[in-house]
Interface confidence: medium
């Protein structure tokens, strides 16, 4: 006999990175027939929703109108069908951005390189922070951590055309409070046509330094539930 229901999916719309004072919606998708959803924040009950009618609704939304550093942190949700509770969702790390200062992002040897060249990004911020984050924009948002007193370096190693794209960096004041984003740097990697066509949409990075975040769209969610399990992976676990 089943003692718990499958865990729900949790994600943030429009994104898990929320500029301060902007709004964000935390979505929790369970099952049709769920009579109660609970959103927990840092181990405490944060909000409750009881969908009506439960048999026609399988997703609830918790709206945060004014993001700030105290609302940034780890969220999870659970739901109940009858007397049976679900497993808790994965953790959603909600991050507040646009705090304090703006870092500078540069790339060596330059923004235009040939496939196979070693490329390193440098993120610099002169205020008190020792952790930096490098993000590549796109369908999958890859986040890499780096450390340094005022600057962190992010070696990509020998690049392929899959590394092409727009990068930004952030200074991190704590796990869930980030600086303003740097100005974007567009990396152009030239390579032969055959390599380009075979290149994956996003490069693969060492598992210990990269976490995958999927940007949230309603369509994407309906298309592939399995993907959404990654949305709430703990960035800084």
């Amino acid at each position: 006999q089943q003692q718990t229901l499958p865990k729900p999916f949790i994600w943030a719309e429009p994104h898990f990175m929320v500029p301060k004072e902007k709004q964000v919606t935390i979505c929790c998708q369970g099952n049709y027939g769920a009579v109660e959803y609970q959103l927990h924040f840092e181990g405490s009950l944060f909000a409750v929703d009881r969908p009506k009618p439960p048999e026609r609704i399988n997703k609830v939304q918790f709206y945060i109108p004014d993001m700030n550093s105290r609302m940034a942190g780890q969220y999870s949700c659970i739901y109940r069908v009858g007397e049976l509770w679900s497993e808790p969702s994965n953790l959603l790390d909600l991050v507040v951005t646009e705090m304090y200062d703006t870092p500078t992002l540069s790339v060596h040897p330059g923004p235009e390189v040939i496939s196979g060249e070693k490329v390193t990004f440098y993120c610099r911020l002169d205020t008190a922070t020792s952790m930096f984050l490098l993000l590549k924009e796109g369908r999958s948002s890859h986040v890499q951590r780096g450390y340094g007193k005022v600057q962190a370096e992010f070696p990509l190693g020998p690049v392929t055309t899959a590394h092409r794209g727009t990068y930004r960096c952030f200074g991190s004041y704590n796990n869930h409070a980030w600086s303003f984003p740097s100005e974007p740097v567009k990396l152009l990697v030239t390579g032969d046509i055959e390599n380009t066509s075979l290149a994956p949409e996003d490069p693969t990075f060492p598992a210990d330094t990269w976490g995958t975040y999927l940007l949230t769209t309603e369509t994407g969610l309906q298309k592939d539930h399995a993907l959404w399990d990654h949305t709430a992976q703990n960035l800084l676990r």
């Epitope: 924040f41 181990g43 009950l45 944060f46 409750v48 105290r70 609302m71 509770w85």
Partner: nanobody
């Protein structure tokens, strides 16, 4: 709608006792950790005591250890705080809340509070 309604506060002499109650509705109480938080005039909020969903874990602020006891009745959706050997420094408004770390009324659910005054 979620509701938390405290009762049991009042005026009591030093050394006296009070039992605070909190009636909860609008969510499944039995799986939710709860706290009693107090706020004295001109001071910040202080968590007095915490209890988990099945009562297997409790914790207390050092200032009330050995004098206060938190308990709950999940069948009746009630949370309690038994306060003995009351001191003048226990004077405050006492709130029951679902918040266990962020003592700010924007987080989680809070009752309206019940006033406890310890004075001779």
């Amino acid at each position: 709608d979620v509701q938390l309604v405290e009762s049991g506060g009042g005026l009591v002499q030093p050394g006296g006792s009070l039992r605070l109650s909190c009636a909860i509705s609008g969510f499944t109480f039995s799986i939710v950790s709860m706290s009693w938080v107090r706020q004295a005039p001109g001071k910040g909020p202080e968590r007095v005591s915490w209890i988990n969903g099945d009562s297997s874990n409790t914790s207390y602020a050092d200032s009330v250890k050995g004098r206060f006891t938190i308990s709950r009745d999940n069948a009746r959706n009630m949370l309690y705080l038994q306060m003995n050997s009351l001191k003048s420094e226990d004077t405050a408004r006492y709130y029951c809340t679902t918040q266990n770390s962020h003592y700010d009324i924007r987080f989680g659910y809070w009752g309206q509070g019940t006033q406890v005054t310890v004075s001779s």
